[in-house]
Structures are given as C-alpha cells and as structure tokens.
Amino acid sequence: VEVQVSEDPVVALVDTDATLRCSFSPEPGFSLAQLNLIWQLTDTKQLVHSFTEGRDQGSAYSNRTALFPDLLVQGNASLRLQRVRVTDEGSYTCFVSIQDFDSAAVSLQVAAPYSKPSMTLEPNKDLRPGNMVTITCSSYQGYPEAEVFWKDGQGVPLTGNVTTSQMANERGLFDVHSVLRVVLGANGTYSCLVRNPVLQQDAHGSVTITGQPLTF
C-alpha cells in the first residue's frame, strides 16, 4: 500500500473548513474490514481520527474531524477539519495499514486576514512643520504575525524610528500596532502596509497632513 498526500501545505482560513488530502491504492478485492486508518498529530502522535474494525471510530480531536466514508473504499483517506483554529496548525500524519503499511505527513497552515489599518496621530492638533509626531497604525485579528512597512508620499520606505508590536488574543489571532515617529514637513502622506505573509494579503492605511485639517 502506498500513501500519497499533497506536498504543499494546506492553507486554511480561521473558522473555515479544511481538507487534508490523503489517498492510497487499494488492491483488487479490498474491503473496509481490512483497513486500519489513523490520522494523528505528527509530533505528539495524538490521535485525531481513526477507522478500524470496519467502521469509523470518530473524532478524537475536538469533535471537528470527519472522513469521507463513501470514498474510503476507493482509497480516499482524506480528513475534513471543521471550523479551523490557530491551534490546529501543524503536521498531520495519515497512516494506512492493510496487508502492508505506509504513512505520509501533510502540513496545515492556518491564516486569517488582517483588518484595514486604522491610523492615529499624537498630537492630533496644532500640528506645524518641524513638530515631532507619532503615527500609529493598528490592524487586527490576523494570523500569522504580520510584516509591517511604512512609506512616505513618494513611496520611499521609512525604516527609522519604527516600533512594531504584535499581541495574540485568546484565539491566537494577532493585533498589530506599529508606531512611526517623524518630524513633519510642510505637508506629507504617511502610509502603512500590513502584510499577511501566508495569504500574501496587503492591508493599507495612510494619513495625509496638509496643514489643517488632517485627512485619513
């Protein structure tokens, strides 16, 4: 028996369902009574889902997993993982034993898009050229950790005086706060880009200072 899985990681959005694909080639005359199928976490060997003794033994993992019972006899041993969480991320091993055994691991990468950044200034009034201001770019509920880039109105990267912090909430999603300290020119635009490295998703925020008033 030869087990095959996708070599590329499966990318799943938080709160959506994901399918971890696994297949084997049944011999002629194969019946499900011969099958021992186990999905487990690769590192800890924690049981996730199993099929043995001719029947689906169910989920051993948060009751959020399912096989495709009608397709098993054709060699489809894929696992459905429902309502994906950040903590589901990692490697899963598909182990198939019939006459012989084989196994392969598939990687699950969890992702969540970042919100459109909100921009705040401090101080936010009586601004004059030459003043030092703090611009904060905040984006929420993303995963994994973001990459943050700042640019001026001409598209020139601003790398000095930038402090970025990322805090995970109780669901494991990150809130990003990036602070840029700049000396104001006569006018200018400051842009913040929050990038999700897995989804290749960019969220943009900007603030334009043209004397008074400010535009966001």
Partner: antibody, heavy 119, light 108 residues
Framework: EVQLVESGGDLVQPGGSLKLSCAAS????????MSWVRQTPDKRLELVAT????????YYPDSVKGRFTISRDNAKHTLYLQMSSLKSEDTAMYYC????????????WGQGTLVTVSA | DIQMIQSPASLSVSVGETVTITCRAS??????LAWYQQKQGKSPQLLVY???NLADGVPSRFSGSGSGTQYSLKINSLQSEDFGSYYC??????????FGGGTKLEIK
C-alpha cells in the same frame, strides 16, 4: 515454509557499530513489512525498527532513533539492521519478524542473533 | 507511545488450573492486540491476534478477550507444555508497537 534466519550478532565495544542481516525464504518477501524485535537480558521485548514492503517508510522508538537504520533488499530477500553508537543497554537477542496483515500480530520469527555490547 | 501494562509479572500454578493474564493499554487500542508464548531458549510464538482470534495450531484451551484498554488471555486446564513466558503487544497507530512487560508462568 516461511523461514527467517538472522546473522551478524557479535561482541562489540560501546560506541561501536554492527550490521545484522535476515535472510527470508518461503514467501514473497517484497509483499510484506518487516520488523526487528529485541529481547533484553531481563526478558523484555522491544520492537526497535519496522519497515514497509517497498522500504519507503520506517519507524523507530526513541531509544534507538538516529542510531539504528532498518533497510531491505527485495531482490536479495534480505532485511538489515545497521546499528551504530552502540550502548551497553543495546545488549539483547535480536529477532527478525514478518509483519502480517493488520491486527494479525507477528506470526513468524527468526531464531535470533545475539548482540553483546561490552568493554 | 502507547504503554502496555501487563500483570501479573509472574505466576506459580499447578497443572489443570485455570489462569488469566491481563494487559492494560494507556489508551484505546481498538482490539489491535496480540498475545505470544515463549518457551525457554526459543523465539516467541503467536497465540492470539486481534484480541480474540486464535492463531493457527493453538489449542482451544487458550482464549483472548477484551476491548478498549483492557485485555486478557485465559488458559483453561493448564498443561505442562503451557509453562513459559507470555507477552501482549498492541498494533494500534503508527509503530513502534509496544509489548507488555511479560508474565512468567511457572509450575507450582
């Protein structure tokens, strides 16, 4: 008749290496997974390596991982166990076994070959 | 890895008696369990597979039972040739499939 004949056991110093062989006959060797099981002087049994029929998948317990390597030559109907960085606790009788259809246990065992690790 | 706790470690009984050896798994192994007998100086021999099935040539006085995490091997009316050591082994999940510590059955 299924036959499994082990060879290669010897007295070896700690840190040394040894390669065990198992010659199989009486069945279609390339259709079966195979395992090495050892029995320590205190009579405990431990499965130290297992390999599937085409040699593509192997498993080891933590006690030997990185030190032992199981392999097979289906053309020669032979199973191997390469052991390196040997320790005194590897002293045991090493048995070659055939993996049966799942849940059917290890129905065929060789006579064993003795490995002694001692200074 | 799954742990197999076998008891008792040793047993001294007379011919004709009935004995029961038990094996407890650290998690559900879904009847993926084998029992072996080993005589002094010999290789282990398969007695029971899939918890309850007798291997070829095994006398009917041997029987296996159990499910989930608890399994047992029963020998009715012990014969002199039954003395030796007995081991359980699970076959659940990915290898290595671990053995119990063994039970030495001696003549009283």
């Amino acid at each position: 008749e299924v036959q499994l004949v082990e060879s290669g056991g010897d007295l070896v110093q700690p840190g040394g290496s040894l390669k065990l062989s198992c010659a199989a006959s009486g069945f279609t060797f390339s259709s079966y997974g195979m395992s090495w099981v050892r029995q320590t002087p205190d009579k405990r049994l431990e499965l130290v390596a297992t390999i599937n029929s085409n040699g593509g998948t192997t498993y080891y317990p933590d006690s030997v991982k990185g030190r032992f390597t199981i392999s097979r030559d289906n053309a020669k109907h032979t199973l191997y166990l390469q052991m390196s960085s040997l320790k005194s606790e590897d002293t045991a009788m090493y048995y070659c076994t055939r993996n049966e259809e799942f849940r059917r246990g290890l129905a065929y065992w060789g006579q064993g070959t003795l490995v002694t690790v001692s200074a | 890895d799954i742990q197999m706790i076998q008891s008792p470690a040793s047993l001294s009984v007379s011919v004709g008696e009935t004995v029961t050896i038990t094996c407890r798994a650290s998690e559900n192994i879904y009847s993926n369990l084998a029992w072996y007998q080993q005589k002094q100086g010999k290789s282990p021999q398969l007695l029971v597979y899939a918890a309850t099935n007798l291997a070829d040539g095994v006398p009917s006085r041997f029987s296996g039972s159990g499910s989930g995490t608890q399994y047992s091997l029963k020998i009715n009316s012990l014969q002199s040739e039954d003395f030796g050591s007995y081991y359980c082994q699970h076959f659940w999940g990915t290898p290595p499939w671990t053995f119990g510590g063994g039970t030495k059955l001696e003549i009283k």
